[in-house]
């Protein structure tokens, strides 16, 4: 009797463990990649910007995949996506084409299904930089909660990468699981 | 035999109250602070921002700390943390000593252990604010999802700290954890 | 006995499974609500926003409700807010009536007890939009934390509403539960 | 180092074009307005124009934009300009130039001398 | 268009004399805080030489006994003690805005 109630508890504590495995969520996804200073495209045209770490400094990552410079999901979810992007010109490291610029960044997904690209979120200025002024800076913000799918992809792009602040504390996009699809 | 099953139950039950207790991650940590503009520095130059409010308002804390102008972590995690700072200026209240500002912030995380500050995040611009017009305004916004150890202390420095808006609504900073360090 | 154990079991099994559920939040709510360019207000001052997708493109809603221009809390908790706001204008769509404007978000909250609203965060910027310029951008970014009780309303007030860009990507606010109310 | 060295002296007659090169070592060329001074024998310096390489945008002064081109070509880091219908006012030492890092032209071309002549 | 003047045309200075040199502007060179006047020092067959930029900063190279000073219309460019090396003749220049101007120039002669 007593044996056979232990069974039950077993399965009971069994079947507990997996629930509580699943309530964090197969450990939760996550995110935080930063610009990748090497590889900064130049120019002033819009470019998707492929170079970011992923385990230095800031960066880190835990079950999603970075790869070819796409943040690639591996758990379908409710995520939350960010970016931040940091434009900045000194006078010292040259001119500026034109004084008239659209800084803008764009968070896409892409779904490999559906060879597509779709933009979920954006942001920027026009921005007036006159050529007499030292120093220019400008940071854009972008944030939303969006569904992801196993093995769709999210990657940024922006104008005037060549205008990009290199720092890990300036210029990055991340994301975080927050719920699974019901 | 039933009291046995009963004391079973028991453990069973208590174990996972444990469990659930745990899984709610002893009721997760969250932080936001609202600037208290009593005490705002004057001048342009960057200084760190002391004083927040933490229990009136908007503003409100649980399983963080806030001492010394700093919001303390008193429990290992992955967090979102998130600033949205204001900065305005009216005629009525003066001149600006210059035209050509930076408006900026920087989230910062210090580690009692080493004692050294890093940046997490930094956002802002450079604005020409004319002379000319009555008012001027920005707002910067920057958010991102980082690792925080216990006793790690979060701060805010801005520029031009005198022209904070002193809102609740305007100029505030928070986190929260979204899940356990694997 | 083996009966009663199995009924013992049933019982631990019950209350678990609703524990897993409450674990789950009664499955968390949220929302991202996207602007319904159809209805957008013309003219330069100061509206609620009224008009949203809440279930086509990007736009979504779970366990909130979408009503007469306000996003409706069905669950006390505490939620992350944001918003995302987008302005433009380009020479084809005629003359602006001002260069000098100000482009303004306020994320407001509504209690139907207490017939009064509150601002909850607000971002923006002064602008000097030349009528040189060909095309013109501008977008603001905000995110706060905050405890929202059932019945509460969220809604968005933006100045010059008929600047608005009307991609999904662009004009949105959404908010998603993190935790319960200890 | 940066530097810029130009072609050499051109002889031409009334109403003909001439093309002068300017090629640039030392920095990255994309980055900086390049820009064309000239001088008259026995006068002062005169601003023409200038090009940013790459997008390839321009900037004329009006005495000169009817007649006067600014090209460039990245792969060879080097800067052209063309000026048509010439008469003999447009005999001069043409210089290119470039700023230093924090405004003033630093660097010139040792000059190119074009004289017009029947 | 910004017109440079400069004045004298010309002028001799005796060795360790101080020569000054004038630049005024039609409108103001002055944005942003700077002041975007630059002084240029050109030898008989020679190219240009900065010296002197954005109104009071010394060029990398250039001696210290020369200065310059002002702001939005009016210039100077000071030598504190001339030497035999200086003659030459010496330009303002502004780049406040397109098209970029030059001064008509002055001729330091050194008695």
């Known amino acids: 009797g007593s044996q056979h109630i232990r069974a039950e508890k077993a399965m009971v504590d069994g079947s507990w463990l997996d629930l509580a495995k699943r309530s964090k969520l197969e450990a939760q996804p996550f995110a935080h990649l930063t610009i990748n200073a090497t590889d900064i495209p130049s120019g002033s045209h819009k470019v998707s910007l492929s170079s970011w770490y992923h385990d230095r400094g800031w960066a880190k990552i835990s079950n999603m995949t970075f790869s070819n410079g796409k943040l690639i999901v591996n758990q379908d979810g409710f995520y939350y996506l960010y970016a931040n992007i940091c434009f900045r010109h000194h006078e010292t490291s040259g001119d500026l084409a034109t004084e008239y610029l659209q800084l803008m960044v764009y968070v896409t997904k892409t779904s490999i299904k559906i060879p597509s690209s779709h933009t979920l979120m954006k942001g920027g200025s026009t921005k007036y930089w006159s050529g007499n002024s030292e120093f220019h800076f400008y940071s854009i913000n972008v944030g939303g909660f969006f569904k992801l799918r196993s093995g769709e992809e999210i990657s940024i792009e922006v104008s005037n990468p060549s205008l990009l602040d290199p720092d890990q504390d300036a210029t990055y996009f991340g994301a975080f699981k927050v719920r699974d699809i019901d | 035999g039933s009291q046995h099953i009963r004391a079973e139950k028991a453990m069973v039950d208590g174990s996972w109250l444990d469990l659930a207790k745990r899984s709610k991650l002893e009721a997760q940590p969250f932080a936001h602070l609202t600037i208290n503009a009593t005490d705002i520095p004057s001048g342009s130059h960057k200084v760190s921002l002391s004083s927040w409010y933490h229990d009136r308002g908007w503003a409100k804390i649980s399983n963080m700390t806030f001492s010394n102008g700093k919001l303390i972590v008193n429990q290992d995690g992955f967090y979102y943390l998130y600033a949205n700072i204001c900065f305005r200026h009216h005629e009525t209240s003066g001149d600006l000593a210059t035209e050509y500002l930076q408006l900026m912030v920087y989230v910062t995380k210090t580690s009692i252990k080493i004692p050294s500050s890093h940046t997490l995040m930094k956002g802002g611009s450079t604005k020409y604010w004319s002379g000319n017009s009555e008012f001027h305004f920005y707002s910067i916004n920057v958010g991102g999802f980082f690792k925080l150890r216990s006793g790690e202390e979060i701060s805010i420095e801005v520029s031009n700290p005198s022209l904070l808006d002193p809102d609740q609504d305007a100029t505030y900073f928070g986190a929260f954890k979204v899940r356990d360090i694997d | 006995g083996s009966q009663h154990i199995r009924a013992e079991k049933a019982m631990v099994d019950g209350s678990w499974l609703d524990l897993a559920k409450r674990s789950k939040l009664e499955a968390q709510p949220f929302a991202h609500l996207t602007i319904n360019a159809t209805d957008i207000p013309s003219g330069s001052h100061k509206v609620s926003l009224s008009s949203w997708y809440h279930d086509r493109g990007w736009a979504k809603i779970s366990n909130m409700t979408f009503s007469n221009g306000k996003l409706i809390v069905n669950q006390d908790g505490f939620y992350y807010l944001y918003a995302n706001i987008c302005f433009r204008h380009h020479e084809t769509s005629g003359d602006l009536a001002t260069e000098y404007l100000q482009l303004m978000v306020y994320v407001t909250k509504t209690s139907i007890k207490i017939p009064s609203s509150h601002t909850l965060m607000k971002g923006g910027s002064t602008k000097y939009w030349s009528g040189n310029s060909e095309f013109h951008f501008y977008s603001i970014n905000v995110g706060g934390f905050f405890k929202l009780r059932s019945g509460e309303e969220i809604s968005i007030e933006v100045s010059n509403p008929s600047l608005l860009d009307p991609d999904q990507d662009a004009t949105y606010f959404g908010a998603f539960k993190v935790r319960d109310i200890d | 180092q940066v530097q810029l060295v130009q072609s050499g002296a051109e002889l031409k007659k009334p109403g003909a074009s001439v093309k002068l090169s300017c090629k640039a070592s030392?920095?990255?060329?994309?980055?900086?307005?390049l820009q064309w001074v000239r001088q008259a024998p026995g006068q002062g310096l005169e601003w023409m124009g200038a090009?940013?390489?790459?997008?390839?945008?321009?900037k004329y002064t009006q005495k000169f934009k009817d007649r006067f081109t600014i090209t460039a070509d990245t792969s060879k880091s080097t800067a052209y300009m063309q000026l048509n219908s010439l008469k003999s006012e447009d005999s001069a030492v043409y210089y290119c130039?470039?700023?230093?890092?924090?405004?003033?032209?630093?660097?010139w071309g040792q000059g190119t001398l074009v004289t017009v002549s029947a | 268009n910004i017109v440079l003047t400069q004045s004298p045309a010309s002028l001799s200075v005796s060795l360790g004399q101080r020569a000054t040199i004038s630049c005024r502007a039609s409108?103001?060179?002055?944005?942003?805080?700077?002041?975007?006047m630059h002084w240029y020092q050109q030898r008989p067959g020679q190219a240009p030489k900065l010296l002197i930029y954005?109104?009071?900063n010394l060029e990398s190279g250039v001696p210290a006994r020369f200065s310059g000073s002002g702001s939005r219309t009016d210039f100077t460019l000071t030598i504190s003690s001339v030497e035999a090396e200086d003659e030459a003749t010496y330009y303002c220049?502004?780049?406040?805005?397109?098209?970029?101007?030059f001064g008509g120039g002055t001729k330091l002669e050194i008695k």
């Open positions: 409108e103001s060179v002055d944005s942003y805080g700077r002041s975007f």
């Open positions: 954005l109104a009071s």
């Open positions: 130039a470039r700023r230093g890092s924090r405004r003033g032209i630093a660097y």
């Open positions: 220049q502004q780049d406040n805005e397109d098209p970029y101007t």
């Open positions: 030392g920095y990255t060329f994309t980055t900086y307005w």
């Open positions: 090009i940013y390489p790459g997008p390839g945008n321009t």
